[in-house]
Amino acid sequence: LSEEADDTDSELGSMKPLHTFCAMKADDGPCKAMIRSYFFNMYTHQCEEFIYGGCEGNENRFDTLEECKKTCIPGYEKTAVKAASGAERPDFCFLEEDPGLCRGYMKRYLYNNQTKQCERFVYGGCLGNRNNFETLDECKKICENPVHSPSPVNEVQMSDYVTDGNTVTDRSTVNNIVVPQSPKVPRRRDYRGRPWCLQPADSGLCKASERRFYYNSATGKCHRFNYTGCGGNNNNFTTRRRCLRSCKTGLIKNKSKGVVK
């Protein structure tokens, strides 16, 4: 059995955040959308993922992990450059691949000390270790030498598209989870709400059977579906009421009548 190194980040552990709002607790706000965001965690001195409800909340909320780190971790950019230049990689770059205790199927990247390259691996969705990056670019910046790195891969964001439900044409990532992708068609013009409300129901990649609701933009109603417990997309609500509250407000009946409440 291989023994893992501790996951604690001693280099940044005792530093104070750059801004007072970095010390605020993650606040998902009163709304019930599911927007993946990042916050600076004062206890771990790391930027971590949380799900933002879509309204209110506080300033300790960032769209990307990189933005969070730049804003709240003192000396982050210097540390990243130093690590990337090969002078000093963080210890966690040398940890072996750990898929974690759970068995979801999430596409992640890790630094392989044998090949000296960042490589893709499948993460189970919980625990594991810190040699685990959401993007190839982030892995390369922190653990590889950028001089030898090709330009970062552009990852497709599903929120920019709506699928028409036809045959699978390629595979790309939705929130770091590998899913079959349907042909892309432009977003419908009669909907002015949140883009994920246009995504098809996605039961995800695990084996549970949890009752959830998704918004059907064709009918303007929220329908029940079975969620398997991990993966999927943001058109996923624990109650019909939350689903309607989040998505129904964007439906425009016609030009003269305005928004349906």
């Epitope: 291989s2 750990d98 068995r103 991990c230």
Partner: antibody, heavy 123, light 112 residues
Framework: QVQLQQSGPGLVKPSQTLSLTCAIS??????????WSWIRQSPGRGLEWLGI?????????RYAVSVKSRITINPDTSKNQFSLQLNSVTPEDTAVYYC?????????????WGQGTLVTVSS | DIVMTQSPLSLPVTPGEPASISCRSS???????????LNWYLQKPGQSPQLLIY???NRASGVPDRFSGSGSGTDFTLKISRVEAEDVGVYYC?????????FGQGTKVEIK
């Protein structure tokens, strides 16, 4: 139905090694949809997770920092069981020790527990 | 380590009445698509703990529907809609957002 049957001595002398075994029926210690853990319970500390092992493409282990220098959890695939060894015990290690299965597929939790073994550390 | 704090530590209940237990984590438990890295267990007198609620709000198999879990971020709640005599015991919350896995100190539910 998964069952975990614990065995091992209930009395250990200070500075010696505590050794417990957890025999698994209804699942495999090598299953890629489970992980196998030891947890202890004492009046002073409540439920305290000690460590876990799991097999995916290879074997992995994780231990609590509080016992990391003294603990070993090993699988025994031939007997379909796993064991706990805790070295250099002190009276502070007196507790009820449980083995437990972590369900990795659906539930993501400790869904099966052994019956518990009260281990007293005393001379 | 993530510290899990439960309240109340003792909860006298009347059969047929509702009951509620709170669990607060020292940092936000990361969750994706409504999945929360928090479980609830019940340890009945003289028994090993048993899984009640997994991923924040899902009942484990065989758990009666009078039990429900809710919450997100750092604040979580276990509710029993109508307490029955067999529900007595100590209830624990447990996080698996990060190592080490940690449990709350327990809430003892007993009949008044």
């Amino acid at each position: 139905q998964v069952q975990l049957q614990q065995s091992g001595p209930g009395l250990v002398k200070p500075s010696q090694t505590l050794s417990l075994t957890c025999a698994i029926s209804g699942d495999s210690v090598s299953s890629d949809s489970a992980a196998w853990s030891w947890i202890r319970q004492s009046p002073g500390r409540g439920l305290e997770w000690l460590g876990i092992i799991y097999k995916r493409s290879k074997w992995y282990n994780r231990y609590a920092v509080s016992v990391k220098s003294r603990i070993t959890i090993n699988p025994d695939t031939s007997k379909n069981q796993f064991s706990l060894q805790l070295n250099s015990v002190t009276p502070e290690d007196t507790a009820v020790y449980y083995c437990a299965r972590w369900h990795s597929d659906k539930m993501w939790g400790f869904d099966d527990w052994g019956q518990g073994t009260l281990v007293t550390v005393s001379s | 380590d993530i510290v899990m704090t439960q309240s109340p530590l003792s909860l006298p209940v009347t059969p047929g009445e509702p009951a509620s237990i709170s669990c607060r984590s020292s940092q936000s438990l990361v969750f994706r698509f409504g999945t929360t890295y928090l479980n609830w267990y019940l340890q009945k007198p003289g028994q090993s703990p048993q899984l009640l609620i997994y991923k924040g709000s899902n009942r484990a198999s065989g758990v009666p529907d009078r039990f429900s879990g809710s919450g997100s971020g750092t604040d979580f709640t276990l509710k029993i809609s109508r307490v029955e005599a067999e529900d007595v015991g100590v209830y624990y919350c447990q996080q698996y957002d990060s190592y080490p896995l940690t449990f709350g100190q327990g809430t003892k539910v007993e009949i008044k």
